[in-house]
């Protein structure tokens, strides 16, 4: 996270880390006791999901193997478009006022709103500096009208663009499918953006949630 | 320090395979996708692929489809390379680099491996 | 697929000269250009990204600019380590990546 500051301790109950044995890969959300939802460009064959500390390497936090993961049928490693995907968890996550489910949207938000980006992602780009600590910055929702004067045909309509006005604000490297969160509910997870991070007027793009909450609803149903 | 380093030069005959390896250290591997780019002699620069490192999520140039799998090891942060049914034209030097970005998306090469040649000849 | 041309393909200058080369993209691209330089016999090194922004440790007197189709590589006083061949390349639709057919800039 870029230009953002530590997270209210426990602020964030339903994130998680994406490990790659002790080493941070990916964000994402609990979504239930077995599912976590993260972006589609975090697959790998084995996780290790953290959950229910703000800090990375703390010993009371859950961890949790997950071997199985279902990317979005549409997910194109070439557009990045319908760029999410859900991890089942091996074991069942113990839910706790550290480990709560986060609400998915009802509704898509509209732009001007302003909502929560967070993650463990490096603060400093493009050298890196990961932080031990959950960082969050806030951003608004941008139109998708503003978003594509910047980034053109590569926005897709299932994208969602979020940033500040001449701002360094934004996501990094880290911070990939974690929580875009307005109004309490989830509206995105970081997907992509332009590098060096944190680029003034080059808004992060995250992953539509709220065009999505069928198929995350169905998907779990259908792996039960 | 932060670096990619290449097999060796290879010499080939016309239809056999070539397999050159990129071994990356001082950086996380899994976190950055790899691409390789190939330069015949006196020619310039031409795309064939890349290999997303956690993922194995691949792309490869529409001319060399069927012909080359790229791979990866992440036990040993080491990407490969694999070229089939070797030909003249193949002739070149091929360098694996970095692709710089966040998220889904890159954007350029930072880093580049120092080039293995690759010889087809009969 | 998007093709990148370069021109000149080749230039002679002299030490102290103001070099510039330019790469056309055959549809916008919008900023997503990139320059790097090759000397023989070794890898090719990122100069400028993003068309015009400068990579860590590149010296000052390389600057990059334009949008959309048409893009400039500004040497402003050619040094003599400056003399190889440099290339652009666009990352705005890919795959696949494509790059220009390079410019060599020789000593005149």
């Known amino acids: 996270i870029i230009d953002g500051a530590p997270c209210a301790r426990g602020s964030h109950p339903w994130q998680v880390a994406l490990l790659s044995g002790n080493q941070l890969h990916c964000g994402g959300v609990l979504v239930n006791e077995r599912w976590v939802l993260t972006a589609a460009h975090c697959k790998m064959n084995e996780y290790t999901v953290h959950l229910g500390s703000d800090t990375l390497g703390d010993r009371r936090a859950q961890r949790i193997k997950a071997s199985k993961s279902f990317r979005h049928p549409g997910y194109s490693t070439q557009t990045h478009v319908n760029d999410l995907m859900l991890v089942k968890l091996n074991s069942q996550a113990r839910l706790s006022s550290m480990v709560k489910k986060v609400r998915l949207p009802s509704r898509c938000e509209p732009p001007g709103t302003t909502c929560t980006v967070s993650g463990w992602g490096t603060t400093t780009s493009p050298d890196v500096t990961f932080p031990s600590d959950l960082m969050c910055v806030d951003v608004k929702l941008i139109s998708p009208q503003d978003c594509t004067k910047v980034y053109k045909d590569l926005l897709e309509n299932s994208m969602l663009c979020a940033g500040i006005p001449d701002s360094k604000k934004n996501a990094c490297n880290g911070d990939s499918g974690g929580p875009l969160v307005c109004r309490g509910t989830l509206q995105g997870l970081v997907s992509w953006g332009t590098f060096p991070c944190g680029q003034p007027n080059d808004p992060g793009v995250y992953t539509q949630v709220c065009k999505f909450t069928k198929w995350i609803n169905d998907t779990m149903k259908k792996h039960r | 320090q932060v670096q990619l380093v290449q097999s060796g030069a290879e010499v080939k005959k016309p239809g056999a395979s070539v397999k050159v390896s990129c071994k990356a250290s001082?950086?996380?591997?899994?976190?950055?996708?790899i691409h390789w780019v190939r330069q015949a002699p006196g020619q310039g620069l031409e795309w064939m692929g890349s290999?997303?490192?956690?993922?194995?999520?691949?792309n490869y140039a529409q001319k060399l489809q069927g012909r080359v799998t790229m791979t990866t090891d992440t036990s040993t942060s080491t990407a490969y390379m694999e070229l089939r049914s070797l030909r003249s034209d193949d002739t070149a030097v091929y360098y694996c680099?970095?692709?710089?970005?966040?998220?889904?998306?890159?954007?350029?090469?930072?880093?580049w491996g120092q080039g293995t040649m690759v010889t087809v000849s009969s | 697929d998007i093709q990148m041309t370069q021109s000149p393909s080749s230039l002679s200058a002299s030490v102290g000269d103001r070099v510039t080369i330019t790469c056309r993209a055959s549809?916008?691209?919008?900023?997503?250009l990139n320059w790097y330089q090759q000397k023989p016999g070794k890898a090719p090194k990122l100069l400028i990204y993003?068309?015009?922004s400068l990579q860590s440790g590149v010296p000052s007197r390389f600057s990059g600019s334009g949008s959309g189709t048409d893009f400039t590589l500004t040497i402003s006083s050619l040094q003599p380590e400056d003399f190889a061949t440099y290339y652009c390349?666009?990352?705005?639709?890919?795959?696949?990546?494509?790059f220009g057919g390079g410019t060599k800039v020789e000593i005149k």
């Open positions: 993003g068309a015009s």
């Open positions: 001082g950086y996380t591997f899994t976190s950055e996708g």
């Open positions: 549809q916008s691209i919008s900023s997503y």
């Open positions: 290999i997303s490192a956690s993922s194995g999520d691949t």
């Open positions: 390349d666009q990352w705005y639709s890919t795959p696949p990546i494509t």
């Open positions: 680099a970095r692709a710089a970005g966040y998220g889904a998306r890159h954007w350029y090469f930072d880093l």
